[in-house]
């Protein structure tokens, strides 16, 4: 990996764990939403998500544990909150998000999300 090779996977995993820890703390501390129907705040293994409004796209900054974060810090990862108040899932039922803007190789162009 061109730029990111200087950062070890071990180091990235440690940063990811710290990101997760901070996220889980914020999930418990943030006030609850005003409405009854909403997508629950969550850590989906990639990013930390606030409560979502049904039928909307939610975006958060690319996670800071990425080795190339300095290149993508002003970009966003997107997640869709379905009309039923459930986060949209991937084809195998896995948590889904469009992280194409956060990929190391991206130079501003958008690509299709994971199949």
């Amino acid at each position: 990996r061109p730029q990111g090779a200087t950062v070890s996977l071990w180091e990235t995993v440690q940063k990811w764990r710290e990101y997760r820890r901070q996220c889980q703390r914020s999930l418990t501390e943030d006030p609850p939403p005003a409405t009854d129907l909403f997508c629950n705040r969550t850590f989906d293994e990639y990013a930390c998500w606030p409560d979502g409004e049904p039928g909307s796209f939610v975006n958060v900054s690319c996670p800071w544990y990425l080795p190339w974060h300095h290149k993508v810090q002003h970009r966003f990862v997107f997640k869709r909150c379905g009309p039923d108040g459930q986060w949209v899932r991937g084809p195998r039922g896995q948590p889904w998000r469009d992280a194409s803007e956060c990929e190391e190789s991206k130079r501003g162009e958008r690509s299709s999300p994971e199949e």
Partner: antibody, heavy 128, light 107 residues
């Protein structure tokens, strides 16, 4: 060695319930997705349900939704299938099978590796 | 749901013949496909994973190829123990779906 052993099958009347179990050994059960697959007499294979890790990700084939419930007890290395409101068309050999996945923290992608180890099966017959 | 169309449903061959079985997916599934062998009264056994990788312990006469929507299982020289039923399985999307099966019979 890696082993999956199903139990709990039998003959049951339509509308009644049955619970199947799948005892796993020889691998880290909590690190695998676990599936149920069935095969009606003389027919092909049909996927029934899957459950990953702690149960946050479960899914079912349409024909059993609302009637069957997949669950697991990682402390007992055991997978379950609770089958309610059984129908004649549920008659089949039921197999459990495992699946490994891999999550890449750099891309956010989940990679799935398919069903690699299967149990020997347990027979469920729904008949009046 | 993704439909897996497997052909032929049955075929006859002689020991030593080359046998080819095909599975077609109703939409692209990358290489998320396995091939399984099932002997009467037994559980399926995986032969090929990721469309073309040979499962450990499986004889090298079995091979798989394809990606996207078209997949093939080939037995280069059929042996007596190979005259059983074969299934493909896609694990790209829920619900997972199997092909209808191919019964390989002795000519």
């Amino acid at each position: 060695q890696v082993q999956l052993v199903e139990s709990g099958g039998g003959v049951v009347q339509p509308g009644r319930s049955l619970r199947l179990s799948c005892a796993a050994s020889g691998f880290t059960f909590s690190s695998y997705g676990m599936h149920w697959v069935r095969q009606a007499p003389g027919k092909g294979l049909e996927w029934v349900a899957v459950m990953w890790y702690d149960g946050s990700n479960k899914d079912y084939v349409d024909s059993v939704k609302g009637r069957f419930t997949i669950s697991r007890d990682n402390s007992k290395n055991t997978l379950y299938l609770q089958m309610n409101r059984l129908r004649a068309e549920d008659t089949a050999v039921y197999y459990c099978a495992r699946e490994k996945d891999h999550y890449d923290i750099l891309t956010g992608y989940n990679y799935y590796y398919g069903l690699d180890v299967w149990g020997q099966g347990t027979t469920v017959t729904v008949s009046s | 749901d993704i439909q897996m169309t497997q052909s032929p449903s049955s075929l006859s061959a002689s020991v030593g013949d080359r046998v080819t079985i095909t599975c077609r997916a109703s939409q692209g599934i990358r290489n998320d496909l396995g091939w399984y062998q099932q002997k009467p009264g037994k559980a399926p056994k995986r032969l090929i994973y990721a469309a073309s990788s040979l499962q450990s312990g499986v004889p090298s006469r079995f091979s798989g190829s394809g990606s996207g929507t078209e997949f093939t299982l080939t037995i280069s020289s059929v042996q007596p123990e190979d005259f059983v039923t074969y299934y493909c399985l896609q694990h790209n999307s829920n619900p997972l779906t199997f092909g209808g099966g191919t019964k390989v019979e002795i000519k």
